[in-house]
Amino acid sequence: RNLPVATPDPGMFPCLHHSQNLLRAVSNMLQKARQTLEFYPCTSEEIDHEDITKDKTSTVEACLPLELTKNESCLNSRETSFITNGSCLASRKTSFMMALCLSSIYEDLKMYQVEFKTMNAKLLMDPKRQIFLDQNMLAVIDELMQALNFNSETVPQKSSLEEPDFYKTKIKLCILLHAFRIRAVTIDRVMSYLNAS
C-alpha cells in the first residue's frame, strides 16, 4: 500500500520532506521485493531484523533524547554553533545531541547506500533479471544525505571481481530492506520532531 504523498510547506524544515520521500520510497521497494521474491523469506513475519549499523552508529541512542528531553537546559551548556553545509541545520544553533543525532543518521544512510549500490550492481548482472533496486529510492537516499551534508569522506562502492552470488544477494536484499524501513521510520520521526520544535 502506497503511503500518502505529503505536500511540504515551503518554509518547512527541509529534511522532513526528504525523510517522508525516503520512507515512501523504501516502503514501495519493500512491497515490490515481497511480490517479486515470493519464494524467498521476505515478509516481516519471516524475516530476521538484522541491523548492519549495529555497533557502528548510535542513531536510536543519539536521537531518542531529542524526543524525551523537553527541557534541554542540561544540553544548553553544551550548545554549539555546529552547522552542516547542507540545508537541514542551516543558520540554526543546535544542541550537541541534535548534531550527534543527525550525524548518526547521515552515517546510517551512507552505510545503507553502499550496501544497496553494491547489491544493485550484482542484481543487474543476474540472467533472471528478477529484481533491481528502485533508482528513486537510491536517489532519495542521496538527496537526504546531501541535505544533511556532513563533511564525511565518500565511501567507494564495494567493487568485486568475483562472480555474483545472486541467491545470497536476494536473501540479503530482503533483510536489509526491512531493516532500512525501520530506520527510515526512525529518521522520519526525528525529522517530524525537529520540524515541530
Epitope: P41, E46, D48, H49, E50, I52, K168, K172
Partner: nanobody
C-alpha cells in the same frame, strides 16, 4: 575463541546422503539468518541454503529438492541434510550468517565419488 564449527563431512557415493551440523556461538546465532555455503577449489564461496531464526528456509536452484536446512535454537546449531548427492556437490561446506558474516570456520570436506 572458535565461533563456528562445522562437521559431518566425508566421502560418499553418488545418490548417498550426509548430515552436516554447525555449532555457532550464541552471539552469532541468536536472531540471525544463518546459511550453509560451499566452496570448490578456484571458485568463490556460494550460499546454498538459508534459514531465518523462526525457521523459514530457502535454497539455491542447484540444491533445491535435495538439501534441507534446519536449526536448533536451543543448541545454537544449524544442520544441512544432503540427499541424492552428486559429484558436483563435492566441496568444502561452511556455515555463517548472511548479512554480516563472522570469521569463517574451518569448514567440512564433502566428497561425492564412486
Amino acid at each position: 575463541e572458535v565461533q563456528l564449527v562445522e562437521s559431518g563431512g566425508g566421502l560418499v557415493q553418488p545418490g548417498g546422503s550426509l548430515r552436516l551440523p554447525c555449532v555457532a556461538s550464541g552471539s552469532i546465532f541468536r536472531g540471525n539468518t544463518m546459511g550453509w555455503y560451499r566452496q570448490t577449489p578456484g571458485k568463490q564461496r556460494e550460499l546454498v541454503a538459508s534459514i531465518t531464526s523462526r525457521g523459514y528456509t530457502s535454497y539455491a536452484d542447484s540444491v533445491k529438492g535435495r538439501f534441507t536446512i534446519s536449526r536448533d535454537n536451543a543448541k545454537n546449531t544449524v544442520y544441512l541434510q544432503m540427499n541424492s548427492l552428486k559429484p558436483e556437490d563435492t566441496a568444502v561446506y561452511y556455515c555463517n550468517r548472511i548479512v554480516v558474516e563472522s570469521q569463517w570456520g574451518q569448514g567440512t570436506q564433502v566428497t561425492v565419488s564412486s
